[in-house]
C-alpha cells in the first residue's frame, strides 16, 4: 500500500514513515498490515486467499500376484518398470474411477514378494470450508475400493483372468497426509500484534480475515459518522465534528448540537 507525497514536506515525511514503512523517494512504502501517508493506519482486511485446491496423499501397499518379480523392476527407467507402471496406473484408474477427488497414483517402490507395490494415491479437491470432511470421505472410499478389488481380483489355479490380480492379505494403508490449511491460524499470524482483534468470516465459502473496522460483516463495528481505527487495544471509533455537531460515545452515536453549547456559553457571559 502506497501514498504519494509531493512538495517541500516530503523530506520530513521520509523520516517519519511508521510501522516499518520505507521511503522510496516519493512515498512511504507500507508493509502489508499498514497504509496511509505515513503507514500509520492498520488495514481492516488481510488477504488470506485459500489455495484453489487442497491435496491429500495416501501411502498404500498392494501385492500384485499376476506378475513375476524380476530385478529389472527395481530400476525405474527400465522397460519393465515403465510397462508395470502403465498397467498398474490403468488398473488403479479403473478401481478409483468413481471418486471425483482421485488424481492418480505414483509408484514409489517395487519389491520382491510376487510384486509388492509401494505407492501413493493422490487426491485433490476444490477448497471449501468442508475440505477436510470431503478428503476424509474420499480416503475412506479409496480404502473400501482397494480392499474390494484386492479381494475379488485373485489368481485361480495360478492364473489371472483380470488385468491384474492381487494378494488379499497384502493390502495396507501406511499413512494419510492432508495439506493443512487453517485460515484462522493464517489470519492470526498475518495480523501480528493485532491478531486478537482479527477474525475469519466466510462469504460464498471464501474466508475473509477482517477486523471490526471492515464494514459489511457480522463483526463489523458501526461508528456511525465516525471512523473506525485499529489500535493495539482494539478497534476504536474516532468521532468527527461537523459544522453543527460534536459526536462522542463509543460508537459516535451521541451528537451534541454546537448551537446549544454556544448558546449556553453566551448565556453565561
Amino acid at each position: 500500500r502506497t501514498t504519494t507525497c509531493f512538495g517541500d514536506g516530503c523530506q520530513n515525511t521520509a523520516s517519519r514513515c511508521k510501522n516499518g514503512g520505507t521511503w522510496d523517494g516519493l512515498k512511504c512504502q507500507c508493509p502489508n498490515l499498514y497504509y496511509g501517508e505515513l503507514c500509520e493506519e492498520v488495514v481492516s482486511s488481510i488477504d488470506i486467499g485459500p489455495p484453489e485446491t487442497i491435496s491429500a496423499q495416501m501411502e498404500l501397499t498392494v501385492t500384485v500376484t499376476s506378475v513375476k518379480f524380476t530385478e529389472e523392476l527395481k530400476n525405474h527407467s527400465s522397460q519393465e518398470f515403465q510397462e508395470f507402471k502403465q498397467t498398474f496406473t490403468e488398473q488403479m484408474n479403473i478401481v478409483y474411477s468413481g471418486i471425483p477427488e482421485y488424481v492418480g497414483v505414483n509408484i514409489t517402490k517395487l519389491r520382491l514378494g510376487s510384486v509388492v507395490v509401494e505407492h501413493d494415491v493422490l487426491l485433490r479437491t476444490k477448497y471449501t470450508p468442508e475440505y477436510k470432511t470431503v478428503l476424509d470421505n474420499a480416503t475412506e472410499v479409496v480404502k473400501e475400493k482397494i480392499t474390494k478389488v484386492t479381494t475379488q481380483q485373485i489368481m485361480i489355479n495360478d492364473i489371472c483372468s483380470d488385468m491384474m490380480c492381487f494378494n488379499t492379505t497384502g493390502t495396507q494403508v501406511q499413512n494419510i497426509t492432508v495439506t493443512q490449511y487453517d485460515p484462522e491460524e493464517d489470519c492470526r499470524k498475518m495480523a501480528k500484534e493485532y491478531g486478537d482483534y482479527f477474525v475469519v468470516e466466510y462469504r460464498d465459502q471464501k474466508p475473509y480475515c477482517i477486523s471490526p473496522c471492515e464494514p459489511g460483516f457480522s463483526v463489523s463495528k458501526n461508528c456511525n459518522l465516525g471512523k473506525c481505527q485499529m489500535s493495539l487495544s482494539g478497534p476504536q471509533c474516532l468521532c468527527v465534528t461537523t459544522e453543527t455537531h460534536w459526536y462522542s460515545g463509543e460508537t459516535c452515536n451521541q451528537g451534541t448540537q454546537k448551537s446549544l453549547v454556544y448558546g449556553h456559553h453566551h448565556h453565561h457571559h
Epitope: V67, E83, M164
Partner: nanobody
C-alpha cells in the same frame, strides 16, 4: 518400441494343421512374455496360449489343450503356434501379443504390445 509381425495364417480343412509365426523386435531384455490370442467374428478376444521366454511358464486355454503347441526360438526372437486337429470353431483372427513383464494373466488388457493379426479359416 516393441514390434510384432505375424505370419502363417490361411485356409485349412477340419483336422488339418497350420503353423503361425510372430517375429518380435525392440526388446531390451531376453526375459519377457509372449502370447497368442484369437478373436472370432462377433466374439471377444480370448487367450489361446502364452509362454515366458525364460521357459519358466506356459499356459493353454482348455479349448486348445493337446492340439496346439506354443514355442519360441529366442535366437530368432520368434514365437510359434503349432495348430493341429483344427476345428471350425478355431476360425478367427490370431494375434501375437507381448509384454516385457513375466505375466500370468489371460486378460488382453494386461498385454501392451500387439501384432496386426493373421486370419485362420477352418472350412471344408
Amino acid at each position: 518400441e516393441v514390434q510384432l509381425v505375424e505370419s502363417g495364417g490361411g485356409v485349412v480343412q477340419p483336422g488339418g494343421s497350420l503353423r503361425l509365426s510372430c517375429a518380435a523386435s525392440g526388446y531390451t531384455s531376453n526375459r519377457y512374455s509372449m502370447a497368442w490370442f484369437r478373436q472370432a467374428p462377433g466374439k471377444e478376444r480370448e487367450v489361446v496360449a502364452f509362454i515366458w521366454t525364460d521357459g519358466g511358464r506356459t499356459y493353454y486355454a482348455d479349448s486348445v489343450k493337446g492340439r496346439f503347441t506354443i514355442s519360441r526360438d529366442n535366437s530368432k526372437n520368434t514365437l510359434y503356434l503349432q495348430m493341429n486337429s483344427l476345428r471350425a470353431e478355431d476360425t478367427a483372427v490370431y494375434y501375437c501379443a507381448a509384454s516385457s513383464l513375466l505375466l500370468q494373466t489371460i486378460n488382453p488388457r494386461a498385454w501392451p504390445y500387439w501384432g496386426q493379426g493373421t486370419m485362420v479359416t477352418v472350412s471344408s
